[in-house]
Amino acid sequence: CKAMHVAQPAVVLASSRGIASFVCEYASPGKATEVRVTVLRQADSQVTEVCAATYMMGNELTFLDDSICTGTSSGNQVNLTIQGLRAMDTGLYICKVELMYPPPYYLGIGNGTQIYVIDPEPCPDSDF
């Protein structure tokens, strides 16, 4: 297993609709054809997997159908979007990149992006 540098923004504020996007950029030492990207959430020392996708270079990222993540890739950059976020989802979102094929296997973990989320103000009840 060889180490690889991964860069991501330090902080992002989600939109009022609970959507946060950020770029995860990795310094690929070789010509990888198969890449796996995992988003981890760290909150209060607990780390949980948010979503993961494996893609072939030049192809779209494919997350599971029920995933809250979507993404696109361009060269050594992955543009990740996380949807359906609530205030309670505020936390550090860490990008983990693995170069799966061809060998050698490379692993890179970013410092994390602190995503802040604020629940929208509830709409006042209407009389209709």
């Epitope: 923004p9 330090a10 902080v11 992002v12 504020l13 989600a14 939109s15 009022s16 996007s21 950020f22 909150a43 209060d44 205030a87 505020t90 550090l92 410092n111 994390g112 602190q114 802040y116 989320v117 604020i118």
Partner: antibody, heavy 117, light 107 residues
């Protein structure tokens, strides 16, 4: 090294607007946010809100909603805070600070805004 | 909104004495609590981040502890240059909030 340099002191009349700038250097501007904090004479620190320089999204203090606008210009690495309909109790020193993963590690030198008729 | 309360409001201390300032959050904020020092006519300066993590360049006499709702800033062996206001600040959830501050002066 990281620096936040703010614009100079302002004297405004009640009802006017003020726009304070905060020029950042020494780091990748869009990787962080910029918060704005004010301090009335002899008082504590009050969070006015912040802006994510990465995407321009903002979060304002509820008591200032509708009167404050925070923006960034990523071409010049500068953040701006505009406060409208100024009142005498808006007289304060206004600070910008870099928002990282939690702590605010760098602050501007402060801008004194005086509202007086 | 998470409300932070600090005690005491004011403390007058002799040099070399130990100072303890407490900060209480209205709900659990984990360790997302930071301490700032502000000297007269100066910008605030980060002293301690994430409840207990030290900051490069800050004297080792400053330390922090706590998690959840109760936090403490300790100044061991106070020096004359430590006369300042001290603020706690939470970054656990929006909106960000500060405590009202504790003013420390030298007897």
């Amino acid at each position: 090294q990281v620096q936040l340099v703010q614009s100079g002191a302002e004297v405004k009349k009640p009802g006017a607007s003020v726009k304070v700038s905060c020029k950042a250097s020494g780091y990748t501007f869009t990787d962080y946010g910029i918060s704005w904090v004010r301090q009335a004479p002899g008082q504590g620190l009050e969070c006015m809100g912040w802006i994510s320089a990465y995407n321009g999204n903002t979060n304002y203090a509820q008591n200032l909603q509708g009167r404050v606008t925070m923006t960034t210009d990523t071409s010049t690495n500068t953040a701006y805070m505009e406060l409208r309909s100024l009142r005498s109790d808006d007289t304060a020193v206004y600070y910008c600070a870099r928002v990282g993963a939690g702590d605010w590690d760098y602050w501007g030198q402060g801008t004194l805004v005086t509202v007086s008729s | 909104e998470i409300v932070l309360t600090q005690s005491p409001d004011f403390q007058s201390v002799t040099p070399k004495e130990k100072v303890t300032i407490t900060c209480r959050a209205s709900q659990s904020i984990g360790s997302s609590l930071h301490w700032y020092q502000q000297k007269p006519d100066q910008s605030p300066k980060l002293l301690i981040k994430y409840a207990s993590q030290s900051i490069s360049g800050v004297p080792s006499r400053f330390s922090g502890s706590g998690s959840g709702t109760d936090f403490t800033l300790t100044i061991n062996s106070l020096e004359a240059e430590d006369a300042a206001a001290y603020y706690c600040h939470q970054s656990s959830s929006l909106p960000f909030t500060f405590g009202p501050g504790t003013k420390v002066d030298i007897k």
